[in-house]
């Protein structure tokens, strides 16, 4: 239905404290650099608005779009050339390209600090004095770091942070109660925001088609025994709200979340037995749990698919006449029937069926030739299996530090003009994968590494398009979703590339090394190797252990000598000599 | 540990009977869809038959269509196979195998596999 005042409805909707909750992180996410202070004094005017909007829905602007007043707020902030440069000469357009120019200048890696966690006591203090300011402003400075996360789950994490507060503030030990809550906080949120950036992508890059796969196999995995009408019922609103959020229509985006959660909840008995827990929650618990909700089990009875999907004789007829919804109905049997495939892999074998058809339905014989599509269908697989099971077995035997070296010096073959620290951060978090998933049994391993893969290749895609410098890597990013990690598992030593030259400052090391946490000890040490690859990018894997070998007995010895500089300025050059050497 | 033993293979004139039993240990047997599988000498090895994990679904191979039936006991933890009108082409080791999550019953998808019961069909 619609409303004289779209704001209004929205605020009605969503409730003060909600509605002032997304307008603060609309506009963060947008105006990245501004200071808090100048955020809560446009959301308090914003609010007043909506207030006013909400008493007369008649008043003059009730009636224009949200997403029009928001542009009009951000176009009437005085210093805003001065601040974000040609963002300003977004305000010159008409919506709705003044929103996509908006939308354009989002930075996916702004110039920020690191968001640092003061002492719990300080923490503590701050949040006594003013909780809602204090929650503010977390809202806001995870928002500009992530523009692109999804909001109301955003406020969701919020309300978990508060109650962490609310709950540790009055423990004996603050520290003690408060780290483990907030450190899981943060490890959740940042998962969080990684996946609601590759649904960003996937629609912005690759269309609503694309991202409409992606939940069905999604979908039909977490509920078996949801019919198909039902789950493309879901999806078709899951793409409406993932769209608004993506496109910076926060208001929208939570009110029509909602409107999901409380669809779901009221046709619980079509969809999942596991739904039961969630629905009794209140609205921002109830949406996040049907989001992280554990999947149903299987239908006891279930066909084989080879009997609509290779037997029929009406396979072609079916294909040709509604050929979306045939492989969606594909899509959504397989998956159903595969909880421990990874959303690639069933990607992928959707679209390994949907080319044999193509190819096939145009023959003289159809079901001769897709007959044995199941069979074909095994090495999009295999490969995936096996590629865990190696990597997993390098991570068992090398642990997690050892097994990020291999990352760094496999991927920095395959990638030489990427930056070293963007090197080091994606061995790193590749690396990380391992122990994440490795641990798992088998039927979760698979999935698992291949999703967080996803999420982190995204991220390398995504940085990558803002200053690309490697055509291969640009291809694996663009040329299709679901092949992705299998276009950079595929690329091996870059043969275009011309090695670096030497360059001793980059393997000179001095005493503060031995004093920085283990952490941060390990990134020096990894940016000296991914290096060593760009200068030697073909050494072998036996050459690379004797200099990190070297390299490594250099370091303990130098950090427990009496007078470690001395150490490091005579044993450096000693070891560098040492290392070009055993590399020439 | 999980264990897949088969029986009940041996020599048969053509046009006889047999039937192959296949005990499961080790698994949760309602959980799994099961299979057989057979190999003839020198050639790859195909899927024969499945059967879904309350044995309400059944998939054949067409070259064995109405001559072949697979049912199951989940109380007895058991799979069995009555082959009838046996031809010389029948002749092969016979896989019995398991499946957690099952689509299309094709090799990859099955889990655990017997070490095999030869049947020869002779003419």
């Known amino acids: 239905e619609a409303h004289k005042s779209e704001i209004a409805h929205r605020f009605n909707d969503l409730g003060e404290g909600h509605f002032k909750g997304l307008v603060l992180i609309t506009l963060s996410q947008h105006l990245q650099k501004s200071p808090f202070e100048e955020h809560v004094k446009l959301v308090n005017e914003v609010t007043d608005f909506a207030k006013a909007c909400v008493a007369d829905e008649s008043a003059q602007n009730c009636g224009k779009a949200i997403a029009t007043l928001f542009g009009d707020k951000v176009c009437a902030i005085p210093s805003l050339r001065e601040t974000y440069g040609e963002l300003a000469d977004c305000c010159a357009k008409e919506d709705p390209d003044r929103v996509e120019c908006f939308l354009q200048h989002k930075d996916d890696n702004p110039n920020l600090p690191p968001f640092e966690r003061p002492e719990p006591e300080a923490l503590c203090t701050a949040f006594k004095e003013n909780n809602d300011r204090f929650i503010g402003h977390y809202l806001y400075e995870v928002s500009r770091r992530h523009p692109y996360f999804y909001a109301p789950e955003l406020l969701y994490y919020a309300e978990k942070y508060k109650n962490a507060l609310t709950e540790c503030c009055e423990a004996a030990d603050k520290a003690a109660c408060l780290t483990p809550k907030l450190d899981a906080i943060k490890e959740k949120a940042l998962v969080s925001s990684a996946q609601q950036r590759l649904k960003c992508a996937s629609l912005q890059k690759f269309g609503e088609r694309a991202f409409k796969a992606w939940s069905v196999a999604r979908l039909s995995q977490k509920f078996p025994k949801a019919e198909f009408a039902e789950i493309s019922t879901i999806v078709t609103s899951l793409t409406k709200v993932t769209k608004e959020c993506c496109h910076g229509d926060l208001l929208e985006c939570a009110d029509d979340r909602q409107e999901l959660a409380k669809y779901m909840c009221e046709h619980q008995d079509s969809i999942s037995s596991k739904l039961k827990e969630c629905c009794v929650k209140p609205t921002l618990q109830k949406a996040h749990c049907i989001l992280e909700i554990q999947r149903d089990e299987l239908p006891t009875e279930l066909p084989d698919l080879a009997v609509d999907f290779v037997e029929d004789k009406e396979v072609c007829k079916n294909f040709a006449e509604a050929k979306d919804v045939f492989l969606g109905t594909f899509l959504y049997e397989y998956s159903r029937r595969h909880p421990e495939y990874s959303i690639g892999m069933l990607l992928r074998i959707a679209k390994g069926y949907e080319a044999k058809l193509e190819k096939c339905c145009a023959e003289a014989d159809p079901h001769a030739c897709y007959a044995k599509v199941f069979d074909e269908l095994q090495p999009l697989i295999d490969e995936p299996k096996k590629l865990v099971q190696q990597n997993c077995e390098l991570f068992d035997k090398l642990g997690e530090y050892g097994f990020q070296n291999a990352l760094a010096v496999r991927y920095t073959q395959k990638a030489p003009q990427v930056s070293t620290p963007t090197l080091v951060e994606y061995a790193r978090k590749l690396g990380s994968v391992g122990t994440k998933c490795c641990s798992l049994p088998e039927t979760e391993r698979l999935s698992c590494t291949e999703n967080y893969l996803a999420l982190i290749l995204n991220r390398l895609c995504i940085l990558h398009e803002k200053t690309p410098v490697s055509e291969r890597v640009t291809k694996c990013c663009t040329e299709s979703l679901v092949n992705r990690r299998p276009c950079f598992s595929a690329l091996h030593v870059d043969e275009t590339y011309v090695p670096k030259p030497f360059h001793a400052d980059s393997f000179t090391f001095h005493a503060d090394i031995c004093t920085l946490p283990e952490k941060e000890k390990q990134v020096k040490k990894q940016m000296a190797l991914v290096e060593l690859v760009k200068h030697k990018p073909k050494a072998s894997e036996e050459q690379m252990k004797t200099v990190m070998g070297d390299f490594a007995a250099f370091l303990k010895k130098c950090c427990d000598a009496d007078n470690k500089e001395a150490c490091f300025t005579e044993d450096g050059p000693k070891l560098v000599a040492k290392c070009q050497a055993t590399l020439a | 540990e999980v264990q897949l033993v088969e029986s009940g293979g041996g020599l048969v004139q053509a046009g006889g009977s047999l039937r192959l039993s296949c005990a499961a240990s080790?698994?949760?047997?309602?959980?799994?869809?099961m299979g057989w599988f057979r190999q003839a000498p020198g050639k790859e090895r195909e899927r024969v038959v499945s059967?879904?994990?309350?044995?309400?679904?059944?998939y054949y191979a067409d070259s064995v269509k109405g001559r072949f039936t697979i049912s199951r006991d989940n109380a007895e933890n058991t799979v069995y196979l009555q082959m009838n009108s046996l031809k010389p082409e029948d002749t092969a080791v016979y896989y019995c195998a398991a499946a957690r999550y099952w689509a299309t019953g094709s090799e990859y998808e099955f889990d655990y596999w017997g070490q095999g019961t030869l049947v020869t069909v002779s003419s």
């Open positions: 059967i879904s994990r309350g044995g309400g679904y059944t």
């Open positions: 080790g698994l949760t047997f309602s959980s799994y869809a």
